[in-house]
Interface confidence: low
Amino acid sequence: FERTRSLQDPCSNCPAGTFCDNNRNQICSPCPPNSFSSAGGQRTCDICRQCKGVFRTRKECSSTSNAECDCTPGFHCLGAGCSMCEQDCKQGQELTKKGCKDCCFGTFNDQKRGICRPWTNCSLDGKSVLVNGTKERDVVCGPSPADLSPGASSVTPPAPAREPGHSPQ
C-alpha cells in the first residue's frame, strides 16, 4: 500500500533560540530579550527565570537555555533546580520553625543543612563506643568489648569539636 505523506510542519524548522511566529506567516523569529526556547519547533519562547532576593544567578539566561539560580551566602538550595532557598544552620544544629536549634543530646548534624540524626548505637552491632559523639559528630564504634585486651578502656575522650568555618590549626 502507498504510505500517505503528511505535510511537514513548517515550525519544525525553527531551531532552539527561536519561535515559530504565527503573526509572521510562521517565520522563525528570535526569542525576545529575557526569553528562551530550549528545543526546536516551539511556537512560543518561555520567560527567563529571574534570580532575585535570596537567589543569585549561577548561569545567565540565554536564547536557548533558562537562567539557573543558586542561593546567596547563608542559604542553600532545596527542590529541583533550586526552586527554594533554605537558611543554613551551624553544624550541631537543625532548622526548625523557630530558627536554628542545637541538636538534642544523643543526636548530631555534621552539615549546615538537614536534621539532627541519632548517634549510632554501637551495641546493636556488638561493638563498643570508641569515641563519644557530639552535637556535630557521630560516635565512633570500636571493637566489641570481648575483643579488648584486659585493662583497655573502651572509651576515649572525643576530639575537641570545631565550630564550622574554623580551619584546623
Epitope: R56, T57, R58, K59, E60, E68, D70, C71, T72, P73, G74, F75, H76, Q87, D88, C89, K90, Q93, G99, C100, Q111, K112, P164, G165
Partner: antibody
C-alpha cells in the same frame, strides 16, 4: 596545593582592551567561583565580578558591567578577565581569587600573584 | 550596594601593644548563625591574605594574636601584641550579597 598563576604585566593605550589570564591548579576548577579584584596604585581593593566555571554563570559589579567580560576555558583550568575601552584610571593590579564555596560560604581564600595593567598614551 | 567604612585610616602602635581596627557595614551582614564579614592582610607587593572569616574564625596558619569580633553592622579586628611582621594594610570585606565590597583599608605601622 591550590595555586593561581596569572599572566604577565601589560601596557596598553587608552581605548584598547586587555585580557588577563589566571591558570588554576590543585583543585577541581569547575567547582568553585573565581573572582576578580583590582587595586589601583596606592588605593584599596575593588571587587569586579565572579564566574562559576561549571556553568559559565557570571556576576558583575555595576561599575564594570559594560566593559568587563569574564570567561573560562575548563579544558585548561584557566579563567580570563577582559576589560575593554581602557582608560588611564584602569591602571591597576588585577587579581584573580578563588572563593571557598563549601556549604555556600564565600570568602576569598586563594589569590593569584596579580597582573599589573598600565594604561598610558 | 553595601558600603564598608573602616577606621582609622592609619594606626601607629608600639611593638607588643594592642592594635584595633573597626569596620562598619551600611546594613547588617549577619544571620543568627553567621556574620558574612572577612578580614585580609596585605603587605607591599603581595596579594591580600585571608586572616579572619565569618567575623571571628581564624584562618588556618594565622597566629592567634589576631582575633575578630562583632555582628550585625559593627566589626573589629584586633592584634593583641603587635609584631614587626604585622606591618601591613588590613581590609574588611562582606560576602552578604553581590556585589562584594571592601573597606578602604587601615595601614598599621610601628610607633
Amino acid at each position: 596545593e591550590v595555586q593561581l598563576v596569572q599572566s604577565g604585566a601589560e601596557v596598553k593605550k587608552p581605548g584598547a582592551s586587555v585580557k588577563v589570564s589566571c591558570k588554576a591548579s590543585g583543585y577541581t576548577f569547575t567547582s568553585y567561583w573565581m573572582d576578580w579584584v583590582r587595586q589601583a596604585p596606592g588605593q584599596g581593593l575593588e571587587w569586579m565580578g565572579n564566574i562559576y566555571p561549571d556553568s559559565g554563570g557570571t556576576n558583575y559589579a555595576e561599575k564594570f558591567k559594560s566593559r568587563v567580560t569574564l570567561t573560562v576555558d575548563t579544558s585548561i583550568s584557566t579563567a580570563y578577565m577582559e576589560l575593554s575601552r581602557l582608560r588611564s584610571d584602569d591602571t591597576a593590579v588585577y587579581y584573580c581569587a578563588r572563593e571557598e564555596a563549601l556549604g555556600g560560604y564565600y570568602e576569598l581564600t586563594y589569590w593569584g600573584q596579580g597582573t599589573l595593567v598600565t594604561v598610558s598614551s | 550596594d553595601i558600603v564598608m567604612t573602616q577606621s582609622p585610616d592609619s594606626l601607629a602602635v608600639s611593638l607588643g601593644e594592642r592594635a584595633t581596627i573597626n569596620c562598619r557595614a551600611s546594613q547588617s551582614v549577619s544571620t543568627s548563625s553567621y556574620s558574612y564579614m572577612h578580614w585580609y592582610q596585605q603587605k607591599p607587593g603581595q596579594p591580600p591574605k585571608l586572616l579572619i572569616k565569618y567575623a571571628s574564625n581564624l584562618e588556618s596558619g594565622v597566629p592567634d594574636r589576631f582575633s575578630g569580633s562583632g555582628s550585625g553592622t559593627d566589626f573589629t579586628l584586633t592584634i593583641s601584641s603587635l609584631q614587626a611582621e604585622d606591618v601591613a594594610v588590613y581590609y574588611c570585606q562582606h560576602s552578604w550579597e553581590i556585589p562584594y565590597t571592601f573597606g578602604g583599608g587601615t595601614k598599621v605601622e610601628i610607633k
